[in-house]
Interface confidence: low
């Protein structure tokens, strides 16, 4: 199709070579007067559309993305051509940074239903550069955490080294929706709830004498609870003795609850005490059986192929540990009577 009628937008992605980061392009279709696809509700200057970008189709996946090869070859369909670029509804996700992402990206509706729709497309010229500004050593991360229940803020990585006074007007999006009131390089959250989690995009305009560009950065925001102040607790076994049948196989399960830690290195292991000797047992891998915002329950089993008389003299000890401390629970086997 002829892309000469597409509206054009220039974007700049300056990525940090120190961190993994993502990037997004929105299919921000314009408003031809008679196109149902690109139609936007008529808004007074004070109103804000519910969705920006792309409000036309009921099904937001009804757009097609293409890349325009620099050598003049025909347009290439993004869906099949680029493994690190994923289309999610009307958004194009770039999963890895790199100058090879530079180029022209075109989006348009999949279904052309009227002659007016033919020109209903956007051409985005994306320039990708590695960050060279070494003076800003502590620029905000592209992965930011907010502590639930407290005050927090989300900083625009490309502007975090500028003071609020110097900062240009910023346009923020959360999960593809315009955050209309936010205009500064930092979003302040009075009280953090789990719904503050998501993908935030900050845009600002940079101009030179020739043209203007939209500088964009993407921030993945995670809402977290504070690191636990407690050592893990053992939920099972509860009893310190266990009735068993000699000669039969036996599985003893150790289940422990670990509180949330940002750097999470849980330890859960079984060892055996026999008079003065003590040794760790080779047992199946631990597995997480429940994971919530605040804690994780991890289980690890010890398996005896056959309970022997010797096992009755031993203590089976489950040991669990996090960065705060450790807990143990021992089990003595007792032969079942009659």
């Amino acid at each position: 199709f002829n892309i000469s009628g597409c509206s054009t937008k220039k974007l700049l992605w300056t990525y940090s070579t120190r961190s993994e980061e993502e990037f997004v392009l929105f299919c921000d279709l314009p408003e031809p007067q008679k196109s149902h696809f690109c139609h936007r509700n008529r808004l007074s200057p004070k109103q804000v559309p519910e969705h920006l970008p792309f409000m036309g189709s009921n099904d937001l996946s009804d757009v097609q993305w293409y890349q325009q090869p620099s050598n003049g070859d025909p347009l290439e369909d993004i869906r099949k051509s680029y493994p690190h670029i994923i289309q999610d509804k009307c958004t194009l996700h770039f999963l890895t940074p790199g100058v090879n992402n530079s180029g022209s990206y075109i989006c348009r509706p999949k279904m052309i239903k009227s002659p007016y729709d033919v020109a209903c497309c956007v051409k985005m010229i994306l320039e990708v550069k590695p960050q060279t500004n070494a003076s800003c050593e502590y620029s905000a991360s592209h992965k930011q955490d907010l502590l639930l229940g407290s005050t927090g803020s989300i900083s625009c990585p490309s502007l975090s080294c500028q003071s609020d006074a110097q900062s240009p007007a910023v346009t923020w999006y959360k999960n593809g929706k315009l955050l209309s009131v936010e205009r500064s390089n930092r979003i302040v959250v009075d009280e953090v709830y789990d719904y503050h989690q998501g993908t935030y995009v900050c845009d600002y305009t940079q101009s030179d004498t020739v043209s203007s560009w939209t500088v964009r950065a993407v921030v993945q925001v995670r809402t977290i609870v504070g690191d636990t102040k407690l050592k893990p607790d053992i939920l099972d076994p509860v009893e310190d003795t266990l009735e068993v049948e000699l000669g039969k196989p036996l599985t003893i399960s150790c289940k422990a609850r670990f509180g949330f830690e940002r750097v999470f290195n849980p330890v859960i292991k079984w060892y055996i005490k026999d008079s003065d000797l003590e040794w760790e047992v080779s047992v199946p891998e631990a597995k997480s059986i429940k994971s919530t915002l605040k804690d994780e329950i991890i289980e690890r089993n010890i398996i005896l192929e056959k309970v022997t008389q010797r096992d009755l003299r031993r203590k089976f000890v489950c040991f669990v540990q996090n960065s705060i401390g450790n807990t143990t629970q021992s089990v003595q086997l007792k032969e079942k009577r009659g």
Partner: antibody, heavy 118, light 111 residues
């Protein structure tokens, strides 16, 4: 490498989850598919989970299977198995080739056998 | 859903000879070429032979050749070896992922 586990004998209607454990590569970079093969029959494509966790299923498999993943595993849940679901279930990595534009199942696990019987 | 119909099984081939297996799709595969071929031996997982209708996968001998476009594809094995005795499957990738499918398979018997 890719390895499936969790296959066993189940009764009809008992949900079963198969796990595909990967090593040597990251699930952040590859899509993963599930394929099955009934005894003595051909291969059937079940579905794929891509790098941003979007799942796509063969039209016959929608509602019957659920694919999900963690950082190193991909699960296939058979929601309500019937005797027709008796098969070897394979997990395969979807590779992308730079010189073409499509995904192909290049690395396969040995498979895990599921038997659904009363 | 798309249906991929393969040459009926079994197909016989003599050592040193040539064998061709066809695969017909009920609709065009994506970009007319997103079709791959696999070889499977009993008790083993499938092995990728060809992707993109005609590109040879890494480590596959050049005796295997893929051709075709759109809805009609062929796998040709020349200078057939005993080790080529297996079942061969085609697999189509379509613009809608829910259409992706395998063919029914063709068993090649080497005499």
């Amino acid at each position: 490498s890719v390895e499936e586990s969790g296959g066993r004998l189940v009764t009809p209607g008992t949900p079963l989850t198969l796990t595909c454990t990967v090593s040597g590569f990251s699930l952040n970079n590859y899509g993963m598919t599930w394929v099955r093969q009934a005894p003595g029959k051909g291969l059937e494509w079940i579905g794929i989970i891509n790098i941003i966790d979007n799942t796509y299923y063969a039209s016959w498999a929608k509602g019957r299977f659920t694919i999900s993943k963690t950082s190193t595993t991909v699960d296939l849940k058979i929601t309500s198995p019937t005797t027709e679901d008796t098969a070897t279930y394979f997990c395969a990595r979807a590779d992308y080739y730079p010189d073409t534009t499509g995904w192909y199942l290049n690395i396969w696990g040995p498979g895990t056998l599921v038997t659904v019987s009363l | 859903a798309a249906v991929l119909t393969q040459t009926p099984s079994p197909v016989s081939a003599a050592v040193g000879g040539t064998v061709s297996i066809s695969c017909q799709s009920s609709k065009s595969v994506y970009n007319n070429k997103w079709l791959s071929w696999f070889q499977q031996k009993p008790g083993q997982p499938p092995k990728l032979l060809i992707y993109g209708a005609f590109t040879l996968a890494s480590g596959v001998p050049s005796r295997f050749r893929g051709s075709g476009s759109g809805t009609q594809f062929t796998l040709t094995i020349s200078d057939v070896q005993c080790d080529d005795a297996a079942t061969y499957y085609c697999a189509g990738d379509y613009s809608s992922n829910s259409d992706d499918a395998f063919g029914g398979g063709t068993e090649v018997v080497v005499k």
